[in-house]
């Protein structure tokens, strides 16, 4: 299936724009802003879909201890240079000539640099720590109703198989959902754990990317779960290189 | 409480195709996938493929070689099955089961369905 | 595809005395910790029912005597002490990787 056949749609990304003129009069959707062809039943690529965001205003935005070497999107929007594939390419520039490398959900990991700056591969994200912080309930939530519904979510929605869902922890009020995707274990038609973690995050902000369908209502056992606050860290396979100037 | 229930038994000649029926009932049809699985008389259980019904797309085990096509309508909260070139060796009962929460367990199935083929 | 192998095919036993059934699988269902492993009962006539999902969490309404075991690629189910009504075929299921798979079941009969 590449888009609802009857509305001619992309229930999976409402940036796009759909007419019948694949083979056959079947549905066929390109994304806003690159124009490529997506698969709309699974989730669109992050790289299609902040090329797609261009126009969008940027918006800032233990349990677990990320690891020195986890990055945070501090960067906010860019408009990213995509491959064939819709994947980030591993080195992005901006109109002054400013380049940095990416990671594969394209956050920097290394120093801003020059047009000779070098990105000799795409370095995977295997390791996404969402830490959510939700809003006061009248009592704590079951942590294996969390759990499982959570996962059920991850499944349903994102169609990320629970095997990449590594675990969910939970200390109310911070709930932290590890998704995890060694290069290995990806098959082809797996949902990359990035392009999930993404959906998640605007579904969380009330910015669904999901056509036609309401926000995201989160319940566990009937009891709405609000969030409140969210913060992405993100694991490379490679560590990030930074220069010592930026840490301090 | 969550009720899946299937259609009644068939008996079919070979070359002919079956369609089997799973209405849900009792929870958001459109919060869990739906499953088929078969067991043929004196084999182990099979499954056949599971369609997500929140999107309506379908995968599928490769054995069975583009001969089933699983759908739903969501408006009737129900999920289908159909088997195209029957042979002998389909006759089988034919389940549907839904996923659980978290770990792709099946928490509930119907009934099943028998369906025979013979000339 | 991953093949799961049950042991013993048949296991005879009385009420009150403890079952212990074996599902060894082809290659490894653990992901971070998570085993893809789940047990179900199947009577005659009947559709099966989940018993033990992710290799040893007891599903909602499941007697306590049942209880499972075991990661990677060496499974149990333990029943502790036989009620007339645990007399059935058990089944183990992957549900790590398409095709999701089913072992050929071990029957519990009374002696």
């Known amino acids: 299936h590449t888009a609802a056949q009857d509305n001619c749609t992309c229930p999976t990304n409402k940036m796009t724009v759909c007419s019948p003129d694949g083979p056959g009069g079947r549905c066929q959707c390109r994304a806003l802003g690159s124009g490529m062809a997506v698969d709309c039943s699974t989730l669109t690529s992050k790289c299609l879909l902040l090329k797609a965001r261009m126009s969008a205003p940027k918006n800032a935005r233990t349990l677990v201890r990320p690891s020195e070497h986890a990055l945070v999107d501090n960067d906010g929007l860019y408009d990213p240079d995509c491959d064939p594939e819709g994947r980030f390419k591993a080195r992005q520039c901006n109109q002054t000539s400013v380049c940095w490398c990416v990671n594969s959900v394209g956050v920097r990991r290394t120093d801003k640099g020059d047009l000779s700056l070098r990105c000799d591969e795409l370095v995977r994200t295997h390791h996404i720590l969402i830490d959510l912080r939700h809003r006061p309930t009248a009592g704590a939530f079951n942590h294996s109703d969390l759990d499982a519904e959570l996962r059920r979510l991850f499944r349903e929605r994102y169609r990320l198989h629970p095997k990449f869902v590594a675990a969910v922890h939970y200390e109310q009020p911070t709930i932290q959902i590890e998704l995890r995707q060694n290069t290995s274990q990806k098959a082809a038609g797996d949902v990359d754990i990035g392009d999930a973690a993404y959906y998640f995050e605007r579904d969380i902000k009330g910015e669904s990317l999901f056509q036609g369908r309401g926000g995201l209502d989160l319940r566990v056992r009937g009891e709405p779960l609000q969030v409140e606050r969210t913060l992405i860290y993100y694991l490379d396979e490679i560590p990030p290189k930074f220069s010592m100037k930026r840490l301090t | 409480q969550v009720q899946l229930v299937q259609s009644g038994a068939e008996v079919k000649k070979p070359g002919a195709s079956v369609k089997v029926s799973c209405k849900a009932s009792?929870?958001?049809?459109?919060?869990?996938?739906i499953n088929w699985v078969r067991q043929a008389p004196g084999q182990r259980l099979e499954w056949m493929g599971v369609?997500?019904?929140?999107?309506?797309?379908?995968s599928y085990n490769q054995k069975f070689k583009g001969r089933v096509t699983i759908t739903r309508d969501t408006s009737a909260s129900t999920a289908y099955m159909e088997l195209s070139s029957l042979r002998s060796e389909d006759t089988a009962v034919y389940y549907c089961?839904?996923?659980?929460?978290?770990?792709?367990?099946?928490?509930?199935w119907g009934q099943g369905t028998l369906v025979t083929v013979s000339s | 595809e991953i093949v799961l192998t049950q042991s013993p095919a048949t296991l005879s036993l009385s009420p009150g005395e403890r079952a212990t059934l074996s599902c060894r699988v082809s290659?490894?269902?653990?992901?971070?910790?998570?085993?893809?492993m789940h047990w179900y009962q199947q009577k005659p006539g009947q559709a099966p029912r989940l018993l033990i999902y992710?290799?040893?969490n007891l599903e909602s309404g499941i007697p306590a005597r049942f209880s499972g075991s075991g990661s990677g690629t060496d499974f149990t189910l333990t029943i502790s002490s036989l009620e007339p009504e645990d007399f059935a075929v058990y089944y183990c299921?992957?549900?790590?990787?398409?095709?999701?798979?089913f072992g050929g079941g071990t029957k519990v009969e009374i002696k």
């Open positions: 290659e490894s269902v653990d992901s971070y910790g998570n085993n893809f």
């Open positions: 369609i997500s019904t929140y999107y309506g797309d379908a």
């Open positions: 089961a839904r996923y659980g929460d978290g770990y792709n367990q099946f928490d509930y």
């Open positions: 299921q992957q549900s790590y990787e398409d095709p999701y798979t």
């Open positions: 992710r290799a040893s």
């Open positions: 009792g929870y958001t049809f459109t919060d869990y996938s």
